[in-house]
Amino acid sequence: VTCDDYYYGFGCNKFCRPRDDFFGHYACDQNGNKTCMEGWMGPECNRAICRQGCSPKHGSCKLPGDCRCQYGWQGLYCDKCIPHPGCVHGICNEPWQCLCETNWGGQLCDKDLNYCGTHQPCLNGGTCSNTGPDKYQCSCPEGYSGPNCEI
């Protein structure tokens, strides 16, 4: 028995006609099975295969090779969270966080907790002590004075 065009199988009771549109992106093999075009998958070949490495949790795509990030995520693979706007010396594990790096504090991690180490403000052999965020105190050697032992 020879089947009509696009019909396959015993009794010609299987149909497959290649298509490339909203309903699917596939060709047909010699048995009438849908074979997805490159970049497509799923029973009807209408799900795009995203960029390799695209986060399955935070990225998606409607076109093959794409990787569109969910709100709050960024990067080529949508695997990097977006920190709180204005976060200076901080990182995030989840979107909009601002987790401060060592020696930084404040809501935006913009307050230096180690002003002495970062700026070394004490001159002429003065000893620096961190007294609070962005605050320090210099103990000046004999013969020197001023906030930074500059006098």
């Epitope: 696009y6 006609r17 909203f22 699917g24 029973p43 009807e44 799900r47 409607k62």
Partner: antibody, heavy 116, light 107 residues
Framework: QVQLVQSGAELKKPGASVKVSCKVS????????IHWIRQAPGQGLEWMGI????????KYAQKFQGRVTMTVDTSTSTAYMELSSLRSEDTAVYYC?????????WGQGTLVTVSS | DIQMTQSPSSLSASVGDRVTITCRTS??????LTWYQQKPGKAPKLLIY???ILDSGVPSRFSGSGSGTDFTLTISSLQPEDFATYYC?????????FGGGTKLEIK
């Protein structure tokens, strides 16, 4: 087994909106599109639109463009059809159906009556 | 949009008769045509898809033929349970329009 279970009958006033749900079971929800079809009393079948359950993309018949919104909630395997600015001519049984090669599975239908 | 012209709109026949319903489309839809049977108060039931493939569980007295623009549903020997309304529908492109229906009544 595959089942599509729709929400109950609705009585609405002209100008109002109605939202009909269609909860599916027995297969992977995002593997198949959901279509919405309606049938006015004593009339034929009228195709309203389709929603791709994986992406949430929908396509509507021109007649309903601007008045219909089809959505899905993949966490509950439920499709929704909302029709706004209702008029008496929208009185009909609304069906959801699953398919690509015709509709092998249908919901039981939801009667929406629009009357003042 | 693709227009679907189904004929006849109603038909009286007797048990054992051979019945043919036709569906014509305004443009080539290849074999993207489906036939449904609907009984009062019930959702439609799929009979035939892709013009001639019988859905599982559908009796072999139902058959479909055609491609392109002209399609036929044939019931070879009417049974009492076959009295219902029949619809064709294309699923080639959006919108998936239905034919107007054929009401099959007992003569």
């Amino acid at each position: 087994q595959v089942q599509l279970v729709q929400s109950g009958a609705e009585l609405k006033k002209p100008g109002a909106s109605v939202k009909v749900s269609c909860k599916v079971s027995g297969y992977a929800f995002t593997d198949y599109a959901i279509h919405w079809i309606r049938q006015a009393p004593g009339q034929g079948l009228e195709w309203m639109g389709i929603i791709n359950t994986y992406y949430g993309d929908s396509k509507y018949a021109q007649k309903f463009q601007g008045r219909v919104t089809m959505t899905v909630d993949t966490s509950t395997s439920t499709a929704y059809m909302e029709l706004s600015s209702l008029r008496s001519e929208d009185t009909a049984v609304y069906y959801c159906a699953r398919g690509y090669d015709g509709f092998a599975y249908w919901g039981q239908g939801t009667l929406v009556t629009v009357s003042s | 949009d693709i227009q679907m012209t189904q004929s006849p709109s109603s038909l009286s026949a007797s048990v054992g008769d051979r019945v043919t319903i036709t569906c014509r489309t305004s443009e080539n839809i290849y074999s993207y045509l489906t036939w449904y049977q609907q009984k009062p108060g019930k959702a439609p039931k799929l009979l035939i898809y892709h013009a001639k493939i019988l859905d599982s569980g559908v009796p072999s007295r139902f058959s479909g033929s055609g491609s392109g623009t002209d399609f036929t549903l044939t019931i070879s020997s009417l049974q009492p349970e076959d009295f219902a309304t029949y619809y064709c529908q294309h699923h080639y492109d959006i919108p998936w329009t239905f034919g107007g229906g054929t009401k099959l009544e007992i003569k």
